[in-house]
């Protein structure tokens, strides 16, 4: 049986006050994606993208989170408290639930590079 793979942007860093794109990609499966959840390290749900209902950004993040690109999420006006783990959860049929992990480090330095590489967790 062929099951899919979640590829993520892995470990990324971004500058305080800047923005960053959190991106996951599900490949190698024909499963239908019914919903994608984005969850923060402290157990907060940031956003949900439902195949039928579209995007829902949770109120606590409405000012700083923008949907996309694609099924990804753009986190804006970064603070040091944004440092930590982020999880994308793909709910699919018939495979079930796929999960990917991204670690974001927010840096004080003005020379912080936004480095992103795709990796399989």
């Amino acid at each position: 049986m062929m099951t899919g793979t979640i590829e993520t942007t892995g470990n990324i860093s971004a500058k305080k006050g800047g923005s960053v794109i959190l991106q996951c990609h599900l490949s190698s499966t024909m499963a239908q994606v019914t919903q994608v959840n984005w969850e923060q390290h402290d157990h907060s749900l940031l956003a949900i993208r439902n195949a039928e209902l579209g995007w829902h950004i949770y109120p606590a993040f409405k000012d700083r989170v923008a949907p996309g690109p694609g099924l990804g999420l753009t986190l804006q006006s970064l603070t040091m408290n944004d440092t930590g783990e982020y999880f994308c959860t793909y709910h699919t049929y018939p495979d079930g639930t796929y999960r990917g992990r991204i670690f974001l480090e927010v840096l004080e330095s003005s020379v912080a590079e936004h480095s992103a590489r795709f990796q399989i967790p």
Partner: nanobody, 131 residues
Amino acid sequence: EVQLAESGGGSVQAGGSLRLSCTTSGYTYSRNCMGWFRQAPGKEREGVATIYVSAASTSFATYADSVKGRFTISLDKAKNTVYLQMNSLKPEDTAMYYCAADPPDRISNPCGPRRPDFGYWGQGTQVTVSS
């Protein structure tokens, strides 16, 4: 040490219902996967239903085609128990039913009934459906 204990099996007539319970000890529900599997005599073990539990306490269930619309998996965190409500039972549902769970925060994809490599397994409970 994580332990899973199934209960609720038994004998029932076709068309009847049973509710299986899987009580966990030493286990934390956070970003993990739990499921029910079954094995009939002389057959391979097959997935029945799984439930993914997020740290934000949302959950998502996935079912094998053979039980969709008849079986329901659910979780009661307060009771440390995962349930499998089985309605409209058929003789072909006769099997030993096993509960399975992943270690919390283990990233194993996907969480679905077609995935066999769970970290923890219970001893099973027998379900017999007669016609």
